[in-house]
């Protein structure tokens, strides 16, 4: 008997073929013997099978003795041995029909979990395979479970069902809904403006929802909103702003705020939020400012840093094109008695400057001079 | 809902070979034939030839010399070509699903044969 | 091959109007027919199969009627948007052939 592997909601085409190439009688019938259709000469007729509206053929195959049945819209209920009478013979098709499903949404968020359910018909025991887009293999039986989905996951599953030594493909959409990054680090002068900007890392047509941006100074004993927002239809829509900082937002995606001016006070780091509509579970993006300044006091020249920085980010004070004077691993640097010239006060990562700040210093009976 | 989207060489030189990509989106691949049908400027339509999941083809016997028609079921699209192309090979060329009838139809590729 | 022969080749309508269209084939196809609109620059449209099912989503003032070899197809009130070429294609057998079209314009 000849097994043929149905997806459900698709076509499928059940072959029959005579030895002679021409049209002849044929009959379609199913294991309870309730004929599905046949043909009276160039006519097709149908039978009372529950498949009357989803079954056809193909009239211009019956002249070289292919007598094909096509079922469209398959469903479970369908898996059934199909029966196929011409020219004296029988022959035999088993049919099985089954459904992968995400039994969720399949827009998910990041670290939530994608079940796959599979239907099958009864007394069937497929396996199933399927592989993510960035390549890792889950296998199962009837429930597949990821658990903690990763932005990587979002793209094309390919599943497999394998039964009877045939397979058959489904491939389902996966969206994991996350900002593009997890974390970010903006370095500003003292007094440059700062732009934070949260851009997603998925597409979706509406979007609506809520969010509130926190923030943890790091002179602050603890953490307060600076902003809170509506989103629908993917306009944005400011709800709420303290009044220092007082921050502006764009009124398209991506979420974009900007400070007006990078000040000591407000170096820290924040936690923006983000609640969808209709999702259990918030998306997250960490943002860090840091922010440096440059001053002379008196004799003493010195250059700051306040916000989270790592403790591998080396702080300089040095005249320009020259050696650095002071070079530390620490959050501020001095230099006594500087010479007049153009001094830079340096944040570097592994000699890759993240923040530069220029003073220029006069001959001591002048002021000095910030650019 | 199935849509139908080709693509391929609109401008050829005599002789050359005319190239076309039907890809289907959203529905079945198995269980159908996928058409090819041109319409030359001016005239009626011509059904060119077809092609199931598993490569069975069937062919218009006046086009057959020069046609062949592929499918790449891992991408859910097939292909049209046809060698030797002339000034009478001009037309619109149109994908198309296929049991009995023809729908939907992709939206239609110009290609201008030589000479 | 089956040939298929429409007729008229163009006629002329006001809104309104009932229209009848006939397609005679070559030889028997019993009811192995189908009926398209195709307006410039669109792909065609199945309005009618088995010569006289409707397809999902066309308007019911088009119908189809015919079996054998002569076929018609009517539309009981003309649309502005029914100004077309109107084709019909036989299924019975290999190659699937087309009738050479009736175009209907504006009176």
């Known amino acids: 008997k000849k097994v043929v592997l149905g997806k459900k909601g698709d076509t499928v085409e059940l072959t029959c073929t005579a030895s002679q190439k021409k049209s002849i009688q044929f009959h379609w019938k199913n294991s309870n013997q309730i004929k599905i259709l046949g043909n009276q000469g160039s006519f097709l007729t149908k039978g009372p099978s529950k498949l009357n509206d989803r079954a056809d053929s193909r009239r211009s195959l019956w002249d070289q003795g292919n007598f094909p049945l096509i079922i469209k819209n398959l469903k479970i209920e369908d898996s059934d041995t199909y029966i196929c009478e011409v020219e004296d013979q029988k022959e035999e098709v088993q049919l099985l029909v089954f459904g992968l499903t995400a039994n969720s949404d399949t827009h998910l968020l990041q670290g939530q979990s994608l079940t796959l359910t599979l239907e099958s018909p009864p007394g069937s025991s497929p396996s199933v395979q399927c592989r993510s887009p960035r390549g890792k293999n889950i296998q199962g039986g009837k429930t597949l479970s990821v658990s903690q989905l990763e932005l990587q996951d979002s793209g094309t599953w390919t599943c497999t069902v394998l039964q009877n030594q045939k397979k058959v493909e489904f491939k389902i959409d996966i969206v994991v809904l996350a900002f593009q990054k997890a974390s970010s680090i903006v370095y500003k002068k003292e007094g440059e403006q700062v732009e934070f900007s949260f851009p997603l890392a998925f597409t979706v047509e509406k979007l609506t929802g809520s969010g509130e941006l926190w923030w943890q100074a790091e002179r602050a004993s603890s953490s307060k909103s600076w902003i809170t927002f509506d989103l629908k239809n993917k306009e944005v829509s400011v709800k709420r702003v303290t009044q220092d900082p007082k921050l502006q937002m764009g009124k398209k995606l991506p979420l974009h705020l900007t400070l007006p001016q990078a000040l000591p006070q407000y170096a820290g780091s924040g936690n923006l939020t983000l609640a969808l509509e209709a999702k259990t579970g918030k998306l997250h993006q960490e943002v860090n400012l840091v922010v440096m300044r440059a001053t002379q006091l008196q004799k003493n020249l010195t250059c700051e840093v306040w916000g989270p920085t790592s403790p591998k980010l080396m702080l300089s004070l040095k005249l320009e094109n020259k050696e650095a004077k002071v070079s530390k691993r620490e959050k501020a640097v001095w230099v006594l008695n500087p010479e007049a010239g153009m001094w830079q006060c340096l944040l570097s990562d592994s000699g890759q400057v993240l923040l530069e700040s220029n003073i220029k210093v006069l001959p001591t009976w002048s002021t000095p001079v910030q650019p | 809902q199935v849509q139908l989207q080709q693509w391929g060489a609109g401008l050829l030189k005599p002789s050359e070979t005319l190239s076309l990509t039907c890809a289907v989106y959203?529905?079945?691949?198995?269980?159908?034939?996928w058409s090819w049908i041109r319409q030359p400027p001016g005239k009626g339509l011509e059904w060119i030839g077809e092609?199931?999941?598993?490569?069975?083809?069937n062919y218009n016997p006046s086009l057959k010399s020069r046609v062949t028609i592929s499918v790449d079921t891992s991408k859910n699209q097939f292909s049209l070509k046809l060698s030797s192309v002339t000034a009478a090979d001009t037309a619109v060329y149109y994908c198309?699903?296929?049991?009995?009838?023809?729908?939907?139809w992709g939206q239609g590729t110009l290609v201008t044969g030589g000479g | 091959d089956i040939q298929m022969t429409q007729s008229p080749s163009s006629v002329s309508a006001s809104v309104g109007d009932r229209v009848t269209i006939t397609c005679r084939a070559s030889?028997?196809?019993?009811?192995?027919l189908a009926w398209y609109q195709h307006k410039p620059g669109k792909a065609p449209k199945l309005l009618i199969y088995?010569?006289?099912s409707l397809q999902s989503g066309v308007p019911s003032r088009f119908s189809g009627s015919g079996s054998g070899t002569d076929f018609t197809l009517t539309i009981s009130s003309l649309q502005p948007e029914d100004f077309a070429t109107y084709y019909c294609?036989?299924?019975?057998?290999?190659?699937?052939?087309f009738g050479q079209g009736t175009k209907l314009e504006i009176k």
């Open positions: 198309a699903r296929v049991i009995n009838w023809f729908d939907p």
């Open positions: 959203g529905g079945s691949f198995s269980g159908y034939y």
């Open positions: 092609i199931n999941h598993s490569g069975s083809t």
């Open positions: 030889q028997d196809i019993s009811s192995w």
């Open positions: 088995a010569a006289s």
């Open positions: 294609q036989q299924a019975n057998s290999f190659p699937y052939t």
